[in-house]
């Protein structure tokens, strides 16, 4: 009922709570002397469903049969209408339409940890749209039944707040949930279990790792568990990996030896627990322990390469380069590299430790036979040294690889191909492909890159340190014993027309011809490997097509003669540069008038 209902009553039959699809009879009746003043026969009773009129009747009472009410709550209000006055509210009623509860399904109970409390969950089934009370019962030993009620409409979880103890772990407990509302009741199927079935241990805690004698091969993982835990599973992985290694252990009593860890690697460890071999469930995984394994001495050998440069008649510069060991080979933080340089005939040797660099340059006499050895050291020891005899890598012309080509292969890759040398190809022990950014000044500080290729290969894809729109000087070496032959080529992974043309810095007259000198185009404007320069000239103030001279690009060249100019004629000259993608805009214009005699 709603409101004070002083003037009358609204009654609902059979009930204010009805099953979906049922019919209700609603009666609105006025109390004595509560009708329209002087005009009791003019009483007009009106029944509203929410704000919509559904029935009216003249007199002291109104009967209405209502069907098709939707799930949920519907409000009915009865009002009195008298002549020349507003409608007066008499009384009202709410009707609750719903369904009886369905049988709760999939009842399951769990106790988190030996000290936790029993909590159960279930599926309610479809919404009843009515106030529904759930009662969860737990029956067990000593003829005892606990029950807990939940008065929340959407109840599908209850925690009893009681703790099952392991005094008799095989004792049976039975849980059942019953849903009750005004239209009926329904109980779940009983769920029977033992302490061991439902107790889910707490995850292990206080996880630690110890390495005996700072060795990765003597590693023990320690943790703490609840008292009844019988089984553990361990999972661990390098921090940068997505794949776990799994180990199952029984009766570990909080410790386990791990034998397959890699040195100098950060690992993540987690542990889970279970009370019984085949009963119950695994705990959640513990919080992660992150720990780094100790170093071990490096394995593997450094990949070493070198470059020789002539200084003068008695001296040469040797530049050594080596690649970092992989993480799995370094097995620790590399503290320094040890470089030993030895003259093989005289036995003179010099050793130096290099930190922070992977290259070393020294000057040695051009005479004698020289060898180097390079090794990497961490806190536990050194790698085996890589030994190299210093030789003239390009001396043996017959060992030079033939038909070397360099072609762009997708983004930032260059495919280098070659043919074996003319000399017995079977003599080749390995090829080395070397590349470095092309700098017109032949700058020795430019980083050197290389890769080794097996003797039966005739191609290599180079991708390390390759940038778009940069020209690389590429050399292919064929090595055989203490001899080497080489061939070189220029290549780029991506090219376009140069952004500018060469800058003419001087024009000089020499015996009836001129010598044009220019500045190289800045590397960042070359946009790949230059193939040609073009020198253009035409008579000043002439509309004729310019003449041109095309010069093949050579790294060191920055001047060229022209001998086809007429004396005492003023010419305008300019230059462009070309890559395989096209020609640059022209560089600066210079005027020149040849003073020599006419032919």
């Amino acid at each position: 009922k709603i409101d004070a209902c002083k003037r009358g009553d609204v009654t609902v039959k059979p009930s204010h709570v009805i099953l979906l699809g049922s019919t209700v009879n609603i009666t609105c009746s006025l109390k004595p002397r509560q009708g329209c003043f002087h005009y009791s026969r003019r009483n007009k009773l009106i029944l509203y469903k929410f704000d919509r009129r559904i029935n009216f009747h003249h007199g002291h009472s109104l009967n209405s049969q209502v069907t098709g009410l939707p799930l949920g709550t519907t409000l009915f209000v009865c009002k009195l209408a008298c002549i020349n006055s507003d409608e007066i509210q008499i009384c009202g009623a709410e009707i609750f339409v719903g369904v009886a509860p369905e049988q709760p399904q999939n009842l399951s109970c769990i106790q988190k940890g030996e000290q936790g409390t029993v909590a159960c969950t279930w599926e309610r089934g479809r919404d009843t749209h009515l106030y529904t009370e759930y009662t969860l019962q737990l029956s067990g030993p000593k003829n005892l039944t606990w029950q807990k009620q939940c008065k929340d409409i959407y109840c599908d979880y209850l925690d009893f707040g009681i703790n099952l103890t392991p005094e008799s772990p095989e004792s049976n407990f039975t849980a059942k949930v019953t849903a009750v509302n005004s239209l009926g009741s329904s109980s779940s199927l009983p769920s029977t279990f033992t302490f061991l079935d439902i107790v889910r241990p707490l995850p292990p805690w206080d996880i630690r790792i110890k390495f005996q004698k700072a060795s990765v091969s003597r590693c023990t993982l320690y943790w703490r568990d609840e008292g009844l835990v019988l089984l553990n599973r361990l999972r661990y992985r390098p921090s940068n990996s997505r794949l776990w290694n799994m180990v199952n252990v029984t009766k570990a009593k909080g410790r386990h030896d791990l034998l397959d860890l890699k040195p100098f690697t950060e690992y993540e460890f987690q542990i889970s627990s279970k009370l019984h071999l085949y009963k119950g469930s695994w705990s959640d995984w513990s919080e992660s322990l992150r720990a780094q394994t100790p170093e071990e001495e490096p394995t593997g050998m450094l990949d070493v390469w070198y470059m020789k440069r002539h200084i003068d008649y008695s001296r040469q510069q040797i530049s050594l380069f080596w690649k970092n060991l992989s993480v799995s080979e370094a097995r620790g933080k590399i503290l320094h590299y040890q470089v030993t340089l030895q003259e093989l005939t005289g036995g003179k040797a010099m050793t130096q430790n290099i930190t922070g660099h992977t290259s070393w340059t020294t000057v040695i006499p051009r005479t004698g036979n020289w060898a180097v050895a390079v090794s990497a050291a961490n806190s536990k020891g050194s790698s085996l040294p890589t030994r190299i005899n210093i030789m003239n890598l390009c001396e043996a012309g017959l060992l030079a690889p033939r038909q070397v080509s360099a072609n762009s292969e997708g983004m930032d890759n260059i495919l280098v191909t070659w043919q074996p040398p003319r000399k017995d190809p079977s003599a080749v022990q390995e090829y080395v492909v070397e590349w470095r950014e092309l700098h017109p000044g032949g700058d020795t500080q430019v980083p050197l890159n290389w890769l080794r290729s097996r003797p039966y290969n005739v191609s290599a894809l180079i991708s390390e340190n390759i940038k778009s729109y940069i020209c690389y000087e590429i050399r292919v070496y064929a090595l055989s014993g203490d001899q080497g032959g080489c061939s070189s080529i220029l290549g780029n992974s991506k090219h376009k027309a140069p952004l500018s043309g060469p800058h003419i810095n001087a024009i000089t007259e020499e015996k009836g011809s001129i010598l044009i000198s220019w500045n190289s185009i800045p590397v960042q404007e070359q946009m790949g490997c230059l193939l040609h320069y073009r020198i253009y000239w035409k008579e000043r103030d002439s509309n004729s097509q310019p003449q041109l001279c095309e010069i093949p690009y050579r790294v060191s060249q920055n001047s060229h003669p022209i001998n086809s100019l007429q004396p005492r004629v003023t010419y305008v000259l300019w230059m462009t540069a070309l890559t395989a993608a096209g020609e640059s805009s022209h560089g600066n214009e210079r005027e020149f008038c040849l003073q020599g005699k006419a032919n």
């Epitope: 409390t117 000593k142 005892l144 606990w146 807990k148 939940c150 707040g161 009681i162 703790n163 099952l164």
Partner: nanobody, 129 residues
Framework: QVQLVESGGGLVQAGGSLKLSCAAS????????MGWFRQAPGKEREFVAV????????AYVDSVKGRFTVSRDNAKNTVYLQMNSLKPEDAAVYFC??????????????????????WGQGTQVTVSS
């Protein structure tokens, strides 16, 4: 110091009903679990039912489950035991008891007399066949 006074006992026919009340005074009623025990002549005191402080958790001995209902009204400091479908073997002196709060409630907590600090004098229930 909590005082407990039971009432509502008496003689009833088998199959009949009784409602026992237990009024508490002298303590914070809502902080105690309230239990009902019974003792027949020559037998040990037996647990019947308990209602926890919140009122939504109860426990019963299986022999009364479905017939007896324990409830409490914290505003009135009273606990009730509604007994329906009484049997001759239900005849006994019924005691009300107040149990101290515990840090952890085990399955058998509040089902033994030693779990309770305060006891009433008891009320006699007789069931005739």
């Amino acid at each position: 110091q909590v005082q407990l006074v039971e009432s509502g006992g008496g003689l009833v026919q088998a199959g009949g009903s009784l409602k026992l009340s237990c009024a508490a005074s002298g303590g914070t009623f809502s902080s105690y679990a309230m239990g009902w025990f019974r003792q027949a002549p020559g037998k040990e005191r037996e647990f019947v039912a308990v209602i926890m402080r919140s009122g939504d958790t109860t426990a019963y001995v299986d022999s009364v489950k479905g017939r007896f209902t324990v409830s409490r009204d914290n505003a009135k400091n009273t606990v009730y035991l509604q007994m329906n479908s009484l049997k001759p073997e239900d005849a006994a002196v019924y005691f009300c008891a107040a149990g101290r709060p515990v840090t952890r409630t085990y399955y058998h907590t509040y089902t033994y007399p030693h779990d309770y600090d305060y006891w009433g004098q008891g009320t006699q229930v007789t069931v005739s066949s």
